[in-house]
Amino acid sequence: EPTMYGEILSPNYPQAYPSEVEKSWDIEVPEGYGIHLYFTHLDIELSENCAYDSVQIISGDTEEGRLCGQRSSNNPHSPIVEEFQVPYNKLQVIFKSDFSNEERFTGFAAYYVATDINECTDFVDVPCSHFCNNFIGGYFCSCPPEYFLHDDMKNCGVNCSGDVFTALIGEIASPNYPKPYPENSRCEYQIRLEKGFQVVVTLRREDFDVEAADSAGNCLDSLVFVAGDRQFGPYCGHGFPGPLNIETKSNALDIIFQTDLTGQKKGWKLRYHGDPMPCPKEDTPNSVWEPAKAKYVFRDVVQITCLDGFEVVEGRVGATSFYSTCQSNGKWSNSKLKCQPVDCGIPESIENGKVEDPESTLFGSVIRYTCEEPYYYMENGGGGEYHCAGNGSWVNEVLGPELPKCVPVCGVPREPFEEKQRIIGGSDADIKNFPWQVFFDNPWAGGALINEYWVLTAAHVVEGNREPTMYVGSTSVQTSRLAKSKMLTPEHVFIHPGWKLLEVPEGRTNFDNDIALVRLKDPVKMGPTVSPICLPGTSSDYNLMDGDLGLISGWGRTEKRDRAVRLKAARLPVAPLRKCKEVKVEKPTADAEAYVFTPNMICAGGEKGMDSCKGDSGGAFAVQDPNDKTKFYAAGLVSWGPQCGTYGLYTRVKNYVDWIMKTMQENSTPRED
């Protein structure tokens, strides 16, 4: 707690002070006072620089004095032997003694009193800008006429702030212009125009004279313009150093004039006016501005239209143009919108084909679709090349945006059939020689794959089982092989309407229209062991002549076994129908005359005992396409025969092409269209 006076005595005073002592006293008097400290007695062991014993007087970080030895008063009327006067209200006194004293020293007696300080004169830094008034315990500042005391109670200034200019044109000058401006003042002027207009300031060089900068280049008095986050200045010196025309790009401008205590000049005068806020003619790539003008100002509207192949993407919606308005802040509305290259996106995948991952999916990019060759080809043409068009679609020159369709290649076996190992009535074959060959397990029979969804077979194969289980892709029909092959699941069986259904099929003598189609639930994936056979064309080129060779294949009866384990095949010639009629039926179920022969039947065989037999029914009689020797077409289907190893009868497929196409069309899925 501060006190106005006090006494400080060395330890044991007036007796001798002890050795090895360190004691300190913290003196504090009230704020606004200084301290007068005086010693009336001093008897401390003397040493050089008072190194042994001493009394130390410290003010803040400054040592005011260090005392030792004996002192006596020079004035017979005063007991004071040493005194200190500090203009601060705190003081520290520290007494130290070392480990030994050669004599007996009595120490010191000291007193302090609070004394008034003259803040106006006692300090280097003058506390008041103009008039300083001292009183006991403090001071106050005052100002000359027309000046006022700032909130800091120290600085005086002219009341030159608070003016707000809202007119679109005006003039502003420093106080007293052209007479010297007041010192130590901060003048603030505000220009506030309607939004959409920018403040433009104009000055003449000769209308500006402000105290020049110091040697470091810092303005002592300064004029500053602040427009939002932009600042112009500070400016000072004789003649305006800045641009004579300042476009602030803002409707709000603050003018700040700051002066110090010295060096007043005539000041400054300026004019201002409001310009409609200009918006820059921005370079927006890949677009056209409408209307095109040299300069755009507040409230101007332009339509920005993207060039072909470019679009404005906002959210998920793409547009080809947008409007932009010159706003009050000098910025265009919708400035974030840009004309970007149209992105056609990742191209759709296609069944049984592929598209290479494009390097770019933007306007002008090119992609190529290919089919899984050699098992599929591109049915709808167009070459498979698509480019990213301006409308955001992948477009082909022929098909437009329609995707290419990969359809199975028909009639091309991966390996040609060669009659290698001669066995009675035929040869061992590989499924790759007859990839269209379908195996039916109940009844044991065959069929021909004609596309992804359809199997062609004989009507008598499916009349008794409308849900046949079929397999493709295996040479052997051993269980272990079929388990690894592709099983086909039927969706529906379509028997030709001309096929007569009998109560007792075993006694059949009429095999006319022995043809059926099986629609599959799922499409078949083509490959080296699974691939369709072609259908005959409707032209006369596909009319068979006697002696024309065809291939048959199947797992039917052989000389040795009722059912073949591995696929067998034979090459046989077409024969006149009468050759089939002439053969005696092996196990007749009726008179020989009862058996029906029609133009819907092909007779073939008779050479070296090569023939189809029980279990081969429904398989294709494959003939080389007369117009494309690399392909085979299903000229016939194994139907019936008078006797195995002689001549066989085959359903003439050419006569049913219309029915086949119509049935497939009427029962196709959207996926297949």
């Epitope: 195996f439 052997s476 051993q478 272990s480 388990a483 690894k484």
Partner: antibody, heavy 119, light 107 residues
Framework: EVQLVQSGAEVKKPGASVKVSCKVS????????MHWVRQAPGKGLEWMGT????????IYAQKFQGRVTMTEDTSTDTAYMELSSLRSEDTAVYYC????????????WGQGTLVTVSS | DIQMTQSPSTLSASVGDRVTITCRAS??????LAWYQQKPGKAPKLLIY???SLESGVPSRFSGSGSGTEFTLTISSLQPDDFATYYC?????????FGQGTKVEIK
């Protein structure tokens, strides 16, 4: 009619080998796939392996790998199964069986050969 | 390898009873499953192939069902000749594994 005739019963000491034969009649071995199955007294059936003519390789059950060898002599239409490093638990009836078609697992079974392993 | 688990191991039943034997595969085998009947000292006899197809000559009281991993053999009305051991076998892929067998005995 296809028939499979197996060699007669054998008694072997532990560590020895046994070779069982299976002669095909009424068909050729090349047209068939021969499998071998065994059954220990009072125990279940165990598939041992087969020759896969499509792949041209012999496939052995994991359990017998390294101890069994199946061979075929097409000139005599005879199949062989040799089991080495015999132990008492190999005592069983060994069957040769032809693979069936179109889902039938086995078609024709041999009469079985009893192999007894005893010290 | 595909493991085949048959249950129960033993089944006691009377003539005329409806009997069901279950076979579970450790992974899907589609319908590639067969059921056999075996009598002491005899080779196994095929009853059912492809999970549900009845071998010719087998009485119609035997039926099979299931696909994937769960299969059953049902004898609709047990006859004296049916007391035997029954095995399931998968033929989907090698190894062609058998179940451990179910013995059907007289109650």
């Amino acid at each position: 009619e296809v028939q499979l005739v197996q060699s007669g019963a054998e008694v072997k000491k532990p560590g020895a080998s046994v070779k069982v034969s299976c002669k095909v009649s009424g068909d050729t071995l090349t047209e068939l796939s021969m499998h071998w199955v065994r059954q220990a007294p009072g125990k279940g059936l165990e598939w041992m392996g087969t020759f896969d003519p499509e792949e041209g390789e012999t496939i052995y059950a994991q359990k017998f790998q390294g101890r069994v060898t199946m061979t075929e002599d097409t000139s005599t239409d005879t199949a062989y199964m040799e089991l080495s490093s015999l132990r008492s638990e190999d005592t069983a009836v060994y069957y040769c069986v032809t693979e069936g078609l179109a889902g039938f697992p086995f078609d024709i079974w041999g009469q079985g050969t009893l192999v007894t392993v005893s010290s | 390898d595909i493991q085949m688990t048959q249950s129960p191991s033993t089944l006691s039943a009377s003539v005329g009873d409806r009997v069901t034997i279950t076979c579970r595969a450790s992974q899907s085998i589609s319908s590639w499953l067969a059921w056999y009947q075996q009598k002491p000292g005899k080779a196994p006899k095929l009853l059912i192939y492809k999970a549900s197809s009845l071998e010719s000559g087998v009485p119609s009281r035997f039926s099979g069902s299931g696909s994937g991993t769960e299969f059953t053999l049902t004898i609709s009305s047990l006859q004296p000749d049916d007391f035997a051991t029954y095995y399931c076998q998968q033929v989907n892929s090698y190894d062609w594994t058998f179940g451990q067998g179910t013995k059907v005995e007289i109650k």
